[in-house]
Interface confidence: medium
Amino acid sequence: EEELQVIQPDKSVLVAAGETATLRCTATSLIPVGPIQWFRGAGPGRELIYNQKEGHFPRVTTVSDLTKRNNMDFSIRIGNITPADAGTYYCVKFRKGSPDDVEFKSGAGTELSVRAKPSAPVVSGPAARATPQHTVSFTCESHGFSPRDITLKWFKNGNELSDFQTNVDPVGESVSYSIHSTAKVVLTREDVHSQVICEVAHVTLQGDPLRGTANLSETIRVPPTLEVTQQPVRAENQVNVTCQVRKFYPQRLQLTWLENGNVSRTETASTVTENKDGTYNWMSWLLVNVSAHRDDVKLTCQVEHDGQPAVSKSHDLKVSAHPKEQGSNTAAENTGSNERNIY
């Protein structure tokens, strides 16, 4: 009689994560008597997957009834497959022995490959805010996919970006892979409402890419522009000076009025108006009693925006130009003497 052969007809099996893998194995003879065992890998470090004789293998079921005397089908099913299950599985026939069974013959092996979907891409931006015209980096990460082949694209407001670098790890064979990409984006003043999108396409997704997004409102800081103007005299000896704080983002802003370098009032921006581009405007005014001053008054509007160094704009109020009579035509100068370049 011909010697027993262990036949594993499938060289490879491809299974999606979460599915059940069927690993086929048949023997050509009932002799010699002895159990079948399944292993992942070969050699001394191989991992026992199923033992017909003993043990508890909750994820493994046999395709046919191994207790039947004439059974020669030793195929198994492994449930709830994960990428960690990938590898080469061997069906091994043992000969009954004493005290231990002896390995008799092994099948050629079946390589189990696991198709796993990538995780939803996570996009993260810089830790600190940046101002327009600066280049900032965004990273995108997705994990746990297999096979290794994957495509990643970056978009800003629907326009594809080209300045990015992508790595898929590990470089060699692995049960699953991760992708990491870094894109560079140049900020503009209009980017408060902008969005950066990372799109990942993988064979398991069938044309429906996964997307991760980041809002540039979390990244951008648009510094304010300041304008100090003198309003018509409200009452005798009183001048209303306003400080227009325009086009800033985020809203966090503190304004201090200085009269000849001395703090007059400090306030926090509260009732701001929002512009179409997402930036804010705010106005503060100061009522100056001209009669309380003998000399000209230097009024300074000093703004601290989002924890940045203060920017300021000054206005010289000529006291001599304010006679006690009606002073609606008073001369006023906006010297901008303490103006700072805030870009």
Epitope: T151, E160, V203
Partner: antibody
Framework: QIQLVQSGPELKKPGETVKISCKAS????????MHWVKQAPGKGLKWMGW????????TYVDDFKGRFAFSLEASASTAFFQINNLKNEDTATYFC??????????WGQGTTLTVSS | QIVLTQSPPIMSASPGEKVTLTCSAT???????LYWFQQKPGSSPKLWIY???NLASGVPARFSGSGSGTSYSLTISNMEPADAASYFC?????????FGGGTKLEIK
């Protein structure tokens, strides 16, 4: 080996219905999308849309909405393409093509449809 | 939709000649999603070049692809009779996916 085998040529009259099949073998059918492409006689290729073989959700190009339908029989690893109320301009060869990261890596041999009164 | 224009529509080349086919897009196409297909009369198209510059299995090394944005090309370094066919560029960067009108390449 991977194969996409399409049904044979069809001769139909205007107003009739035709259903073309595309049987896949050599790979797990539900792992790859299936796309349909039209090629009118002597003309170029026109992508018509695709069907997600996992969810059976079809996507049609605007020009192929209404009279056209993609469907599946996943247990038989087969995709179908149906045209209702046939018109003369439907005369063409229709191809199924496997999707995935290598879009169009395998194509059916094509099914020639002739619509004539 | 993105319209792909191939030029020239028809061309003939002598054996050994260098041939360049171009594909121009009306808006930017991701290089990862720009493919070329070869089709011979009576046959289905064959994937020839994927992701702008990668040769599909079995494609001779005399073929190459390049390009980015709205301009792509397929080059044959030295034409052979077996290369006589129609070549179509294809984008699946954005819906609806589209093909170019094709270039019919003949042998002189």
């Amino acid at each position: 080996q991977i194969q996409l085998v399409q049904s044979g040529p069809e001769l139909k009259k205007p107003g009739e219905t035709v259903k073309i099949s595309c049987k896949a073998s050599g790979y797990t059918f539900t792992h790859y999308s299936m796309h349909w492409v039209k090629q009118a006689p002597g003309k170029g290729l026109k992508w018509m849309g695709w069907i997600n073989t996992e969810t059976a959700e079809p996507t049609y190009v605007d020009d192929f909405k209404g009279r056209f339908a993609f469907s599946l029989e996943a247990s038989a690893s087969t995709a179908f393409f149906q045209i209702n109320n046939l018109k003369n301009e439907d005369t063409a060869t229709y191809f199924c093509a496997r999707g995935g990261l290598r879009q169009g890596d395998y194509w059916g041999q094509g099914t020639t449809l002739t619509v004539s009164s | 939709q993105i319209v792909l224009t191939q030029s020239p529509p028809i061309m003939s080349a002598s054996p050994g000649e260098k041939v360049t086919l171009t594909c121009s897009a009306t808006s930017s196409v991701s290089a990862s999603y720009l493919y070329w297909f070869q089709q011979k009369p009576g046959s289905s198209p064959k994937l020839w070049i994927y992701s702008t510059s990668n040769l599909a299995s079995g494609v001779p090394a005399r073929f190459s692809g390049s390009g980015s944005g709205t301009s792509y090309s397929l080059t044959i370094s030295n034409m052979e009779p077996a290369d006589a066919a129609s070549y179509f560029c294809h984008q699946w960067s954005s819906y609806p996916y589209t093909f170019g009108g094709g270039t019919k390449l003949e042998i002189k």
